[in-house]
Interface confidence: low
Amino acid sequence: QLTTESMPFNVAEGKEVLLLVHNLPQQLFGYSWYKGERVDGNRQIVGYAIGTQQATPGPANSGRETIYPNASLLIQNVTQNDTGFYTLQVIKSDLVNEEATGQFHVYPELPKPSISSNNSNPVEDKDAVAFTCEPETQDTTYLWWINNQSLPVSPRLQLSNGNRTLTLLSVTRNDTGPYECEIQNPVSANRSDPVTLNVTYGPDTPTISPSDTYYRPGANLSLSCYAASNPPAQYSWLINGTFQQSTQELFIPNITVNNSGSYTCHANNSVTGCNRTTVKTIIVTELSPVVAKPQIKASKTTVTGDKDSVNLTCSTNDTGISIRWFFKNQSLPSSERMKLSQGNTTLSINPVKREDAGTYWCEVFNPISKNQSDPIMLNVNYNALPQENGLSPG
């Protein structure tokens, strides 16, 4: 049976399409191509006489068509108006005509889209934001990406307008993006430049650092306050309810027992109009809250050099303390291979080398007292045997 196949079926505007013919009968006088689903002399594109190998343009010929001896039709520089059906009529030598209809679809090469927004500076937990992907084009699929990932399933995310509009209900500070929209049709795809949201939020409850409560007389008291906020919060300090200063940091040199009391940090966001406070008790005393002796443990105490790694862990039940590490009376880390993690509670050495053998201990301390662990010995061995394949390492 006579058939046609469009190559490709979906064509980009300005490109070319080949209407291929399959199962063309052997004994032929000629054939004609028509625009549409039926034979219509008014819509003939071209006729071809086999005997003379002569092609004759028809009324629907645009000058962009080329017919080949195998009956295939090439259409160049296609436009969206070329979309549709094409019918081939074959006149056989037995005068029985055969017909076959094919089709293709022309799609535009899509432009780079852009994102418009109804609110670029929303307030957290209050405002909604609607993004719209421009331009609006026919036969186009609209996709959205947040942080380079397809949209997560969330009741706060709504698609509308044929997926061209993305609405964020009740934005949060984590909704900054970036947001991208992608437009697709069967022949092209294009993604917008990223757009980010400036979400106004906060302040959250402030945190006063350091966490220490106890200080010795004569020490310097340096407190810092931080509250997550956009735009950044404005800070002020009160001591025992009395305003002191409008700064993020409070510094009092050479403190005395009279500086004991309640220290309040006040954080304000002028855009959201919200305020948050945190109170911290400071005790200035000669008495020493004793820090307990920490415990030190090793993932292994005998390791193979240049191969193994080891983790040393310093454990303490005390709070508000800091930890530091020592090796052969030197503070650590002392090389790129040594890493501290989990608030300095873990010392990792990767890989272990010969010079890492020896005694390690940790020390916990607060502004008032400190205590050391018992030492632990790390042994480093080296394999004397050659590798199985006989090749030297490295």
């Epitope: 196949e5 469009s6 190559m7 490709p8 079926f9 080949l18 291929l20 380079n148 990932q149 397809s150 069967p186």
Partner: antibody, heavy 121, light 110 residues
């Protein structure tokens, strides 16, 4: 349920020929581009050839051009690979695989169980 | 020598997160979508990720894909013993007019 079943593998001498078939079921075969992918023993995957859903577009890996020919019969829901002038390096398990994207984002979502072709004297 | 470059091996312990990289060029990863396949011993490959980061239905969300420039990565979180397999990346190559695979990465669950 989508199924792809390869057949036609076996032992063949260097220079010989073989024709592999892949019978498809559980989906509209004529709507999908199809590929052959091979895997030499103990080695990685190597794409061999692809044919469009209508059979009009065909591509081959450089290593098989002129020796292997892909074809399809949509009426029989079958994909073929004609293998000529076979070499020892053609020894592999041959998988047929379906591309659900019509080539817009080429990928293979269903694979057959594979058929082993051994080229040896 | 594969057109796409993967590390030959990777390992992790159960529950861990492991990432496998795939490096290519502008003619493949840079301008085409990337897929990831899992091949368990003695079985046919299985599609894990297509179009850079999309998961077919039935693939656990422990598997995720990403792409940046001419490189792509497969991340497996909450590693399980049944994840021990060979993993391949793949993409269409505009210069070769063909599909290319990475050399494969053997993942061992310790």
């Amino acid at each position: 349920e989508v199924q792809l079943l390869e057949s036609g593998g076996g032992l063949v001498q260097p220079g010989g020929s073989l024709r592999l078939s892949c019978a498809a079921s559980g989906f509209t075969f004529s709507n999908y581009a199809m590929s052959w992918v091979r895997q030499a023993p103990g080695k990685g995957l190597e794409w061999v050839s692809v044919i469009s859903h209508g059979g009009g577009s065909i591509y081959y890996a450089d290593s098989v051009k002129g020796r292997l020919t892909i074809s399809r019969d949509n009426s029989k829901n079958t994909l073929y690979l004609q293998m000529n002038s076979l070499r020892a390096e053609d020894t592999a398990v041959y998988y047929c695989a379906r591309d659900p994207t019509k080539g817009y984002a080429p990928t293979f979502d269903y694979w057959g169980q594979g058929t082993l072709v051994t080229v040896s004297s | 020598q594969s057109v796409l470059t993967q590390p030959p091996s990777a390992s992790g312990t159960p529950g861990q997160r492991v990432t496998i990289s795939c490096s290519g060029s502008s003619s493949n990863i840079g301008n085409n979508y990337v897929s990831w396949y899992q091949q368990l011993p003695g079985t046919a490959p299985k599609l894990l990720i297509y179009a850079d980061s999309r998961r077919p239905s039935g693939v656990p969300d422990r598997f995720s894909g990403s792409k940046s420039g001419t490189s792509a990565s497969l991340a497996i979180s909450g590693l399980r013993s049944e994840d021990e397999a060979d993993y391949y990346c793949g993409a269409w190559d505009l210069s070769l007019n063909g599909y290319v695979f990475g050399g494969g990465t053997k993942l061992t669950v310790l």
